[in-house]
């Protein structure tokens, strides 16, 4: 049994790390393989993530951490039973995939303006919380290519469009997700989208 | 809001025995190292004792034998079981929560060892 | 035991001058776990900076920190009524725990 592709591991930067690998042939990830895990501080223990299969040869393990800081550096070994198939170590401030946004709401009772909000995915003490910028996917469900991204750079979670600059009188559906430029962390994973009916009043056109 | 609150200094004869508490709130106490650091009248920080998520736990020379240091995540609390006090145990004690360093303090509780 | 020295002692300095602060290891440290703190009387310690040169939330970026190996340096470019206090480095270190030096006093002249 042996390691074809090495695991590689993304961080929430909470509390949760990812890590994926492909073995060289068809595997039962959970009963031939344990991943142990080390957070490189005095008092910290190891312990040991029970992968789950991802693809016939592929294997996944999401390691539970204690709360992120930048200097943290966890060891990994992939063990099979008595054999040391892999070691290697993960710095989850280098490799940053944020948690995706919840709670996204559109407001379409402020005249003629629509108003997205969502809710950050962060506690106010973790680092991320004050750096992630975000990208708003609106779409048709009509007109597949209506379809168009809002990046907001700024912090607050919101969104304010003119209800004009989307055809009145369809459904559209939004989403949203983040970033943080600090950690040059990968997009996070789109929110659960929502849906509206877009409609406003025309403006009369005067002859 | 991250708040650590801390209670049970006073007075204790030498030899004698306290408990010291500090109560987290505002961050996800189970998954935080936590510690305690002294300063002595008119003196300097000293780091005390800190404990890891998984209760491991390690303590500063001048106190280890004496001083227990305990978490219980249920109640999102933090302890200092001082046994055996000498004078130069006296202090203001913080609880403290952090890693490599301390970004979260408690207000500090004093620990007065006289006869 | 890593042994940190600060010095000066005492700072004397007026209002918007510049404030130079060292921190002296008796062996290397990391600097992924060097931090600076400020201290008022009868307040907590306040992080300032951590890993040598990172300010802490909310911190002001009139305050700086640099260096490496066993030498560190925090600086104040210019001090504020509000910046007299004690300044502590503090170190950890795998093997011999947490230690912090033994406090510089920032002072109006």
């Known amino acids: 049994m042996k390691v074809l592709q090495e695991p590689t591991c993304v961080s929430d930067y909470m509390s949760i790390s990812t890590c994926e690998w492909k073995m060289n042939g068809p595997t039962n990830c959970s009963t031939e393989l344990r991943l142990l895990y080390q957070l490189v501080f005095l008092l910290s223990e190891a312990h040991t993530c029970i992968p789950e299969n991802n693809g016939g040869a592929g294997c996944v393990c999401h390691l539970l951490m204690d709360d992120v800081v930048s200097a943290d550096n966890y060891t990994l070994d992939l063990w099979a039973g008595q054999q040391l198939l892999w070691k290697g170590s993960f710095k989850p401030s280098e490799h940053v995939k944020p948690r995706a946004p919840g709670n996204l709401t559109v407001h379409t009772n402020v005249s003629d303006t629509l108003l997205l909000t969502w809710s950050n995915p962060y506690p106010p003490d973790n680092y991320l919380y004050n750096h992630l910028t975000y990208a708003v996917n609106i779409w048709s469900e009509n007109d597949p290519a209506d379809f168009r991204i809002y990046n907001v750079t700024y912090l607050e979670p919101s969104l304010r469009i003119a209800a004009s600059t989307l055809k009145s009188g369809i459904s559209y559906r939004a989403r949203v997700r983040a970033w943080a430029q600090c950690y040059n962390t990968t997009w996070s994973e789109w929110s659960p989208s929502t849906k509206w009916h877009n409609s406003y009043r025309e403006p009369f056109e005067q002859h | 809001e991250v708040q650590l609150v801390q209670s049970g200094g006073g007075l204790v004869h030498p030899g004698g025995s306290l408990r010291l508490s500090c109560a987290g709130s505002?961050?996800?106490?189970?998954?935080?190292?936590m510690f305690w650091v002294r300063q002595a009248p008119g003196k300097g920080l000293e780091w005390v004792s800190g404990?890891?998520?998984?209760?491991?736990?390690n303590y500063a020379d001048s106190v280890k034998g004496r001083f227990t240091i305990s978490r219980d995540n249920a109640k999102n609390s933090l302890y200092l079981q001082m046994n055996s006090l000498r004078a130069e145990d006296m202090a203001v004690y913080y609880c403290?929560?952090?890693?490599?360093?301390?970004?979260?303090w408690g207000q500090g509780t004093l620990v007065t060892v006289s006869s | 035991e890593i042994v940190l020295t600060q010095s000066p002692g005492t700072l004397s300095l007026s209002p918007g001058e510049r404030a130079t602060l060292s921190c002296r290891a008796s062996?290397?440290?990391?600097?992924?776990?060097l931090a600076w703190y400020q201290q008022k009387p009868g307040q907590a310690p306040r992080l300032l900076i951590y890993?040598?040169?990172s300010r802490a939330t909310g911190i002001p970026d009139r305050f700086s920190g640099s260096g490496s190996g066993t030498d560190f340096t925090l600086t104040i470019s210019r001090l504020e009524p509000e910046d007299f206090a004690v300044y502590y480095c503090?170190?950890?270190?795998?093997?011999?725990?947490?230690?912090f030096g033994q406090g510089t006093k920032v002072e109006i002249k």
């Open positions: 505002g961050f996800t106490f189970s998954r935080n190292a």
């Open positions: 503090q170190q950890y270190d795998h093997s011999a725990g947490w230690t």
């Open positions: 890993g040598a040169s």
């Open positions: 403290a929560r952090g890693r490599y360093y301390f970004p979260w």
């Open positions: 062996q290397s440290v990391s600097s992924s776990y």
């Open positions: 404990i890891g998520t998984g209760g491991a736990t």
